[in-house]
């Protein structure tokens, strides 16, 4: 991953913080929030993007070359945006216009665009859809996707908070 211009860390921090709040509002838990289950193993997790040690999102990794981490976050945002665009969220039960889900979708797009280099090729993914006999699964899938997104965004927000605090170019005072 070549070194390229850094993002606007402060803006990313603000947007990611807002996204965390929207994801929470879109799927506020009744009771204790258990983002990641302790019994999950690697095999069951491999279809969900996670920010891991080797992604360079730790303070030292960000200092050395933040592009590795930003690429991982970009991939995760694209993955979740793709799911929010799918039949899982478009079908019944219908989501109200201007609902937290709609705002979440818009903000997710905003952060993606902020991180998306102009020349970055867009990956094409198969759009998941539910057959008529699977319609009942929709609320369960929505719940799982939003829980997973909450966990992803919580880590991404910490990355951007660290970047905003330590990697932002200081303003040079003019004489």
């Amino acid at each position: 991953v070549p070194r390229s211009s850094s993002p606007d860390w402060a803006q990313c921090q603000q947007l990611s913080r807002n996204l965390c709040m929207l994801a929470w509002n879109a799927h506020a838990p009744a009771g204790h929030m258990n983002l990641l289950r302790e019994e999950e193993d690697e095999e069951t997790k491999n279809n969900v993007p996670r920010i891991q040690c080797e992604d360079g999102c730790d303070p030292q990794g960000l200092k050395d070359n933040s592009q590795f981490c930003l690429q991982r976050i970009r991939q995760g945002l694209a993955f979740y945006k793709h799911l929010l665009d799918s039949d899982i969220f478009k079908g019944e039960p219908a989501l109200l216009p201007d609902s937290p889900m709609e705002q979440l979708h818009t903000s997710l797009l905003g952060l993606s665009q902020l991180l998306q280099p102009e020349d970055h090729p867009r990956e094409t993914q198969q759009m998941p859809s539910l057959s008529s006999s699977q319609q009942w699964q929709r609320p369960l899938l929505r719940s799982k996707i939003l829980r997973s997104l909450q966990a992803f965004l919580a880590i991404a927000a910490r990355v951007f908070a660290h970047g905003a605090a330590t990697l932002t170019e200081p303003l040079v005072p003019t004489a």
């Epitope: 799927h27 009744a30 204790h32 799982k144 997973s148």
Partner: nanobody, 121 residues
Amino acid sequence: EVQLVESGGGLVQAGGSLRLSCAASGRSISSYAMGWFRQAPGKEREFVATITWSGGSTYYADSVKGRFTISRDNAKNVVYLQMNNLKPEDTAVYYCAADLSSGLDVDFGSWGQGTQVTVSS
């Protein structure tokens, strides 16, 4: 592993009510989506109702909408199915199931033994 035991079934007149319970043991079900399914004699098992892990979202088969209500008490590790205005066509063995999949898919991998509900006309 989660063990599920259904109870509350029985014989009831059309128009009557029953409340089914599904008690879980072996592990807390608070992280899992839960569902009720049923199987009538000579028919395939069919979906009745589901509830998300938090209880924040429920979904029903068209045939039971407005008559059945699914709920859960995570503190007690129990899921309920309140069945009102029962019809003869509701006669079936009712099964409780837990979605144990930790990926972004739905997989009801843990099932109870079922409880018989018979509605007479």
